[in-house]
């Protein structure tokens, strides 16, 4: 819990507490913004981002965005608040410990995005279907 000598200021989104009133730590995420990438046609890729940042607000999670168009491939790594859309999409998988890429519809490019909430989880981005719970075979395994 927040000790009495630490002042909880009004409207302070830097102090986030869980259901027990315990202060929530900020996430540690890879944060290189947009970089050119060689990640293509692979089950998973490393971000090759050497910068690990303390996310500014404790509610933020790690995000990775992979984009491919006619000219290049980029990988974006950031922190972001899952209550807010990113690139106009909701971070629906923000509670996941792994960054499992899901394709999003964007005209003129191939666009994948993932979010996750374990330390530096956006360093390893996963495209493989075997991690995707929309896979019926995996659902069968889960519910057996």
């Amino acid at each position: 819990t927040i000790p009495p000598h630490v002042q909880k200021s009004v409207n302070n989104d830097m102090i986030v507490t869980d259901n027990n009133g315990a202060v929530k730590f900020p996430q540690l995420c890879k944060f290189c913004d947009v970089r050119f990438s060689t990640c293509d046609n692979q089950k998973s890729c490393m971000s090759n981002c050497s910068i690990t940042s303390i996310c500014e607000k404790p509610q933020e999670v790690c995000v990775a965005v992979w984009r491919k168009n006619d000219e290049n491939i980029t990988l974006e790594t950031v922190c972001h608040d899952p209550k807010l859309p990113y690139h106009d999409f909701i971070l629906e998988d923000a509670a996941s410990p792994k960054c499992i890429m899901k394709e999003k519809k964007k005209p003129g490019e191939t666009f994948f995005m993932c979010s996750c909430s374990s330390d530096e989880c956006n360093d390893n981005i996963i495209f493989s279907e075997e991690y995707n719970t929309s896979n019926p075979d995996l659902l069968l395994v889960i519910f057996q």
């Epitope: 819990t1 927040i2 869980d18 027990n20 315990a22 202060v23 929530k24 730590f25 900020p26 996430q27 540690l28 690990t52 303390i54 404790p58 909430s117």
Partner: nanobody, 120 residues
Framework: EVQLLESGGGLVQPGGSLRLSCAAS???????RMWWVRQAPGKGLEWVS?????????YYADSVKGRFTISRDNSKNTLYLQMNSLRAEDTAVYYC?????????????WGQGTLVTVSS
């Protein structure tokens, strides 16, 4: 009983340096990630820096990168924060805190804090 005791704060001119210390006792210091957190007057908490249990990896808020250095001496159960090129906006109470083993929820232990005032 777990105790965290910060020291080293004080009044310093802009551009100056200070070294904060946090003496830890009552727990296995070399097994925990440790943090420096600060709170400016009337403001919220700012997560300044963190260091892994073995000291091999460190993390910094953008606002202090290149100016502050976190370190630890596990043989002395002590956490440090070397603060260089201090600015007025670094004025705050600085707390050390231990991250609990269960992950991201809960500073289970805080120090009482040490006040750093940067002013000419």
């Amino acid at each position: 009983e777990v105790q965290l005791l910060e020291s080293g704060g004080g009044l310093v001119q802009p551009g100056g340096s200070l070294r904060l210390s946090c003496a830890a006792s009552g727990f296995t210091f070399d097994q925990d990630r440790m943090w420096w957190v600060r709170q400016a007057p009337g403001k919220g908490l700012e997560w300044v820096s963190a260091i892994e249990s073995g000291g091999h990896r460190t993390y910094y808020a953008d606002s202090v990168k290149g100016r502050f250095t976190i370190s630890r001496d596990n043989s002395k159960n002590t956490l440090y924060l070397q603060m260089n090129s201090l600015r007025a906006e670094d004025t705050a109470v600085y707390y050390c805190a231990k991250q609990n083993e269960s992950g991201r929820s809960g500073f289970d232990y805080w120090g009482q804090g040490t006040l750093v005032t940067v002013s000419s």
